[in-house]
C-alpha cells in the first residue's frame, strides 16, 4: 500500500533571466527511493539515481543544475519555461509518487515568489 505523500514548492513565480529552485519532499513512507525523474510536461529534464548520481538531459545542460538535495535549479529563465513541472519518485516497494509544481516566469521586475521550504 502506498502511504507516502509528496510536498512540493507548489505554485511559484520568478523573473525572466533569473533562477528558481524546484523542490519536492517525500514523507510518511519507509520505501526506498531508487530514482527521481524531473519532467517538464512530457519532456525529461533530469534524473537523480540514489546510487548512481545525476543525469541532466542534453537539451537542458546549459540551464539546469542538480540540487539542492533531490531538487533542481533552473537558470536563465525564459517566458517559455512557464508551465508544469513534475518530480517523479520511483520507490521500492511502494511504486511511483508524483509531485506537481507550476512555474510562472514573469517579464516584470516584480515577481512574487511562492512559499519555499528548506529540506534539512
Amino acid at each position: 500500500m502506498m502511504t507516502g505523500t509528496i510536498e512540493t514548492t507548489g505554485n511559484i513565480s520568478a523573473e525572466k533571466g533569473g533562477s528558481i529552485i524546484l523542490q519536492c519532499h517525500l514523507s510518511s513512507t519507509t520505501a526506498q527511493v531508487t530514482q527521481v525523474n524531473w519532467e517538464q510536461q512530457d519532456q525529461l529534464l533530469a534524473i537523480c539515481n540514489a546510487d548512481l548520481g545525476w543525469h541532466i538531459s542534453p537539451s537542458f545542460k546549459d540551464r539546469v543544475a542538480p540540487g539542492p538535495g533531490l531538487g533542481l535549479t533552473l537558470q536563465s529563465l525564459t517566458v517559455n519555461d512557464t508551465g508544469e513541472y513534475f518530480c517523479i519518485y520511483h520507490t521500492y516497494p511502494d511504486g511511483t509518487y508524483t509531485g506537481r509544481i507550476f512555474l510562472e516566469v514573469l517579464e516584470s521586475s516584480v515577481a512574487e515568489h511562492g512559499a519555499r521550504f528548506q529540506i534539512p
Partner: nanobody, 116 residues
Framework: EVQLVESGGGLVQAGGSLRLSCAAS????????MGWFRQAPGKEREGISL????????YYADSVKGRFTISADNAKNTVYLQMNSLKPEDTAVYYC?????????WGQGTQVTVSS
C-alpha cells in the same frame, strides 16, 4: 502490460564472466532510463548501472566500474549487462528496471552466484 524478462544468470567461478539480458515488451514510447539493480541477502536493493534513453549516457556504481558494461539494443527493446572479473561479493539477485514518464517497472530477477 509491461513485462521485463531477465536471463543469463547462473553459477560462475570468481574471475569469470556472465552476460545478463533484459527483454522488455509493452513499454510505452517515452522510455527514460534502463538500468540494473542487485540485492544481496539481507541488504537493500542497490543500483549498479544505468543507461539513459536521451543520449545513451551510462553510469556505474564504484563497486562495478571497470568490470561491468551496460548496453542497449533499442530495436530489440533489450538491455544487457556484461559482467567480467566477477567476485564473490557480486553474488546477488540481479533485477532490470525501466523508467518511463509513467513509472518504474521491474523484472522478476535472475540469480548470480560467484563461488571462490
Amino acid at each position: 502490460e509491461v513485462q521485463l524478462v531477465e536471463s543469463g544468470g547462473g553459477l560462475v567461478q570468481a574471475g569469470g564472466s556472465l552476460r545478463l539480458s533484459c527483454a522488455a515488451s509493452g513499454i510505452p514510447a517515452s522510455i527514460r532510463t534502463m538500468g540494473w539493480f542487485r540485492q544481496a541477502p539481507g541488504k537493500e536493493r542497490e543500483g549498479i548501472s544505468l543507461i539513459t534513453s536521451d543520449d545513451g549516457s551510462t553510469y556505474y556504481a564504484d563497486s562495478v566500474k571497470g568490470r561491468f558494461t551496460i548496453s542497449a539494443d533499442n530495436a530489440k527493446n533489450t538491455v544487457y549487462l556484461q559482467m567480467n572479473s566477477l567476485k564473490p561479493e557480486d553474488t546477488a539477485v540481479y533485477y532490470c528496471a525501466w523508467t518511463t514518464n509513467r513509472g518504474m517497472d521491474w523484472g522478476q530477477g535472475t540469480q548470480v552466484t560467484v563461488s571462490s
